[in-house]
Interface confidence: medium
């Protein structure tokens, strides 16, 4: 229903705490360079204005849209052009073009320093002094680095952060209590970020229909006992929620997400038998829990998929009468039978089915033509299954770091033009798939591996879009989202690349590497590995292993030496010579 004052309506629905958190996230995601204090001031002004509108919905400007109110606030920031360049041009536009312009200027890779966690004592002191400000800083720092982070989910992670600090800051050994718990939250939040970015990419590039298809497949896998009408309703609502969040309408998004959670909990009987535990939780935990609830038990008596979609004499008639509905029911029926498939695979199968019907229903004898369609799915299913087996076997053999290195070599050969930091980031993220998915039961591996890889490759595509240096990458990123992962997997050594000459300075290291944390050390070594591959893209695995083992040995020896500097300056050139010879 229409409300006289949209801002008052959202403030009332969400409550002050969530309202302020969401406005802070929105501002931080739009203007990523502003300090926390600048944003906090704007948030307070917006909140005070919202309270005025709650008191009197007819007060001046209370009838304005949220985009108008928020956009006016952002455009009033001093020195906007100096700090944000052409983003300031957005302020010359009217809504809705102004908001679209802000969205286009969101930076997926802002030049901000990594978010460093303070040491435990300092963190606990500032948390105890002012928990609200502390959590505000957390929301601001995450949101500006991840401008498409799912806002209501970020509130959930802030709540987790808060609970961990409350618990650990009361302990004697704060450090050992905080570190593993906060690392766990950070890891989950980073995965949540790339997954949500993928959803927004799907929405931006291919529209609501594409996202809704994704949602139908995902929901059908999770709720196989819900009927098609129920799944369609949930998918439509979920599409609206995600569209709002991806579009920067964070208050509406959080409000509608809460409504969806409420609906699901009120209709458990027609959705799933697994929802009760989630529904007993408070709002943020409830919505989070529902988003990753375990799959319901599949109905025992499901007929073979062929009955309605291959053997039925009316297939072409049903398809012609309502294409989207018929394909939707196919996707629903196939997905609810296959919780062991990735959503990407299910969408590829639906696409194959659609293409088969398009072709066959125009022929003289359609049933003879589409009769083999299910058999034609086989290679599409085998390809990701083989990918999972090969990669999980490799992960089990090499461990996470070794697996990342294998992926780094592979991807540097596929796209040597891509900058080394981007290749290293991508390989490290792709390599985490092993730890994340390969330890799962067999039937959960494929959906975990492929949907995670797709999300990471989406980030590779977004970064590459900014500076499109590789025709290989451009080709894979230009196609449909569900074809990306198979496209990247199929890439081989880029023959158009002209290798760089071996440069000693690229492989010269100093004693400061010895004091770096393990993660930073790994990144340095992986940077060197990528540069080696760029120098010799056709180097064998054996040659690269020899060089990297020698390099690891060199670091180990010099970092243990009494006079580290001398060791690095004398042994370093010898290492370079040996590397050169090994790769000759």
């Amino acid at each position: 229903e229409a409300h006289k004052s949209e801002i008052a309506h959202r403030y009332n629905d969400l409550g002050e705490q969530h309202f302020k958190g969401l406005v802070l996230i929105a501002f931080s995601q739009y203007l990523q360079k502003c300090s926390y204090d600048e944003h906090a001031k704007l948030v307070q002004e917006v909140t005070d204005f919202a309270k005025t509108c709650v008191a009197d919905e007819s007060a001046a400007n209370c009838d304005k849209s949220l985009h108008t109110l928020f956009g006016d606030k952002l455009c009033a920031i001093p020195n906007l052009r100096e700090n944000y360049g052409e983003l300031a041009d957005c302020c010359t536009k009217q809504e809705p073009e102004r908001n679209e312009c802000f969205l286009q200027h969101k930076d997926d890779n802002p030049s901000l320093p990594p978010f460093e966690r303070p040491e435990a004592e300092a963190m606990c002191t500032s948390f105890k002094e002012n928990p609200t400000t502390f959590m505000g800083h957390y929301l601001h720092e995450v949101a500006r680095r991840h401008p498409y982070f799912y806002a209501p989910e970020l509130l959930y992670y802030a709540e987790q952060y808060n609970e961990i600090l409350t618990q650990c800051c009361a302990e004697a050994d704060k450090e050992s209590c905080l570190t593993p718990k906060l690392d766990g939250v950070k890891e989950k939040a980073l995965v949540s970020s790339v997954r949500q970015r993928m959803k927004c990419s799907s929405m931006q590039k291919f529209g609501e229909r594409a996202f809704k298809a994704w949602a139908v497949a995902r929901l059908s896998q999770t709720f196989p006992n819900a009927d098609f009408a129920e799944i369609t309703k949930l998918a439509t609502d979920l599409t609206k929620v995600n569209k709002e969040c991806c579009h920067g309408d964070l208050l509406e998004c959080a409000d509608d997400r809460a409504e969806l959670a409420k609906y699901m909990c009120e209709n458990q009987a027609t959705i799933s038998s697994k929802l009760q535990t989630c529904c007993d939780k408070p709002l943020l935990k409830k919505a989070h829990c529902l988003s990753e609830v375990e799959h319901d038990t599949m109905p025992a008596d499901l007929p073979a998929i062929a009955a309605d979609f291959v053997e039925d004499q009316e297939v072409c008639k049903n398809y012609a009468e309502a294409k989207d509905v018929f394909l939707g029911t196919f996707l629903y029926e196939y997905s609810r039978r296959h919780p062991d498939y990735s959503v990407s695979l299910l969408l590829r199968l639906a696409k194959k089915y659609e293409a088969t019907l398009e072709k066959c229903c125009a022929e003289a004898n359609p049933p003879a033509c589409y009769g083999t369609v299910l058999a034609e799915f086989q290679p599409l299913v085998e390809e990701p299954k083989n990918l999972v087996k090969t990669n999980c076997d490799l992960y089990e053999k090499l461990g996470e770091y070794g697996f990342q290195n294998a992926i780094l070599v592979r991807y540097t050969q596929k796209a040597p033009q891509v900058s080394t930091p981007t290749l290293v980031e991508a390989a490290r993220n792709l390599g985490r798939v092993g730890t994340k998915c390969c330890t799962l039961p067999e039937d959960q591996r494929l959906p975990c591996v492929e949907d995670y890889l797709s999300a990471i490759l989406n980030r590779v595509c977004l970064l590459h879009e900014k500076t499109p240096v590789s025709e290989h990458v451009t080709k894979c990123c230009s196609g449909s989202l569900v074809e990306r992962r198979p496209c990247f997997s199929a890439l081989t050594v880029d023959e158009t690349y002209v290798p760089k000459e071996f440069k000693a300075e690229t492989f010269t290291f100093h004693s400061d590497i010895c004091t770096l944390p393990e993660k930073e050390k790994q990144i340095k070594k992986q940077t060197a590995l990528a540069e080696l591959v760029k120098h010799k893209p056709k180097a064998t695995a054996e040659q690269l292993k020899t060089v990297m083992d020698d390099f690891a040995q060199f670091l180990d020896t010099c970092c243990k030496a009494a006079d580290k500097d001398t060791c690095f300056s004398t042994e370093g050139p010898n290492l370079v010579t040996r590397c050169k010879d090994a790769l000759a």
């Epitope: 033009q417 500076t467 590789s470």
Partner: nanobody, 115 residues
Framework: QVQLQESGGGLVQPGNSLRLSCAAS????????MSWVRQAPGKEPEWVSE????????IYADSVKDRFTISRDNAKSTLYLQMNSLKPEDTAVYYC????????SSQGTQVTVSS
């Protein structure tokens, strides 16, 4: 549509100089590191030199070091290669590239060093 148009090649005697230019369009030139690559008849392509986005960092193949200078003008979206003390073995087609790939669309410019 990314386009790279090389020019400035020609026939010169050993010891002389040439200045190659590469006009870039269809992308934000200042965001990319650029390089020169050359291919002599019947030989594999050879990397010559590379320059960072800002122009601050440059590296050269040993075979051209101290004779060739790479530079760029971001305002004009143009890459340059100043070639001094040319030798017969510098004879090749010279290509400017983004990221080090020989683009199918790039024509290159012929440099012939001969007495």
């Amino acid at each position: 549509q990314v386009q790279l148009q090389e020019s400035g090649g020609g026939l010169v005697q050993p010891g002389n100089s040439l200045r190659l230019s590469c006009a870039a369009s269809g992308f934000t030139f200042r965001n990319f590191g650029m390089s020169w690559v050359r291919q002599a008849p019947g030989k594999e392509p050879e990397w010559v030199s590379e320059i960072s986005q800002s122009g601050e960092n440059t590296i050269y193949a040993d075979s051209v070091k101290d004779r060739f200078t790479i530079s760029r003008d971001n305002a004009k979206s143009t890459l340059y290669l100043q070639m001094n003390s040319l030798k017969p073995e510098d004879t090749a087609v010279y290509y400017c590239t983004i990221g080090g790939s020989l683009s199918r669309s790039s024509q290159g410019t012929q440099v012939t060093v001969s007495s």
